[in-house]
């Protein structure tokens, strides 16, 4: 059963992000806000504290368009924002194990 202390690291984190974000791709860090000059990355948020699917979604490269608002243009991101390709090794069954924990 899922425990709040469970975390996602390494390949498990990568695979889960790949499934959640699909062909949108994902980032490992977001731009620092004006309030906090330091940006917290997905590794900090999910590998060292519990994280959920909603949090993972925020690291996807382009927001998924909702059925109600298909006209919304994709978010424009800085040119220097690192964009990591979806790995060639991803396996659905592997991701399923991780995501089932996060859904509980």
């Amino acid at each position: 059963a899922y425990r709040p202390s469970e975390t996602l690291c390494g390949g498990e984190l990568v695979d889960t992000l790949q499934f959640v974000c699909g062909d949108r791709g994902f980032y490992f860090s977001r731009p620092a806000s004006r309030v906090s000059r330091r940006s917290r990355g997905i590794v900090e948020e999910c590998c060292f504290r519990s994280c959920d699917l909603a949090l993972l979604e925020t690291y996807c490269a382009t927001p998924a368009k909702s059925e109600r608002d298909v006209s919304t243009p994709p978010t424009v991101l800085p040119d220097n924002f690192p964009r990591y390709p979806v790995g060639k090794f991803f396996q659905y069954d592997t991701w399923k194990q991780s995501t089932q924990r996060l859904r509980r």
Epitope: C9, G11, V14, F28, E44, C47, Y84, F89
Partner: antibody
């Protein structure tokens, strides 16, 4: 040359303490996960602990609460503080370089292996 | 925790032989599997990362394959310097775990 050099091993009594150091050179130490792995005499490899560039840590259950991994990025040095030592902690301790902090290499592909290793330092726990 | 099981634990072979070592994970680890070579009295040396990627400087006679739970390290033509112990290691999740090792000895 990329290099890791451990020091601080020795003979210690059960219940005692020891602090291992690992001096890194030839790469940007502050960008990488660093790892301690040990190997008991005649046995296989056992992961002990990992520390991310910004200081977050992970431990094997067998050492949790007794060992503390830390790093000084300004000195390019990794440490392992070992307290409440037991006979079963007797091993060669290796430090190793892990992946970049966010797991991806410079070409943008996932990399998670331990690619640089020190020569090891022997820790013997015996009365 | 993910258990890694290597087989065989030891094998005897001659120079020129094709050698295959297998590693099995207790649950799927996708392709996050690394292989190391260790010689007596020396530190391990990374051979292959993420199942099939050859580390720089490693001879092309070494190759890796597999996915999910079953992985293989193959040495296409064993050389005298290849007699050593080989370990697999999963990078899928903490705690990071190694296989028990496979010792390749001279026949």
């Amino acid at each position: 040359e990329v290099q890791l050099l451990e020091s601080g091993g020795g003979l210690v009594q059960p219940g005692g303490s020891l602090r291992l150091s690992c001096a890194a050179s030839g790469f940007t130490f502050s960008r990488y996960w660093m790892i301690w792995v040990r190997q008991a005499p005649g046995k296989g490899l056992e992961w002990v602990s990992s520390i991310r560039s910004s200081g977050e840590t992970k431990y094997a259950d067998s050492v949790k609460g007794r060992f503390t991994i830390s790093r000084d990025n300004s000195k390019n040095t990794l440490y392992l503080q070992m307290n409440s030592l037991r006979a079963e902690d007797t091993a060669v301790y290796y430090c190793a370089r892990g992946p970049l902090s966010d797991y991806y290499d410079s070409s943008g592909y996932y990399f998670d292996a331990f690619d640089i290793w020190g020569q090891g330092t022997m820790v013997t726990v015996s009365s | 925790d993910i258990q890694m099981t290597q087989s065989p634990s030891s094998l005897s072979a001659s120079a020129g032989d094709r050698v295959t070592i297998t590693c099995r994970a207790s649950q799927s680890i996708s392709s996050y599997l690394n292989w190391y070579q260790q010689k007596p009295g020396k530190a391990p040396n990374l051979l292959i990362y993420t199942t099939s990627n050859l580390q720089g400087g490693v001879p092309s006679r070494f190759s890796g394959s597999g996915s999910g739970t079953d992985f293989t390290l193959t040495i296409s033509s064993l050389q005298p310097e290849d007699f050593a112990t080989y370990y697999c290691q999963q990078g899928y999740s903490f705690p990071l775990t190694f296989g028990g090792g496979t010792k390749v000895e001279i026949k």
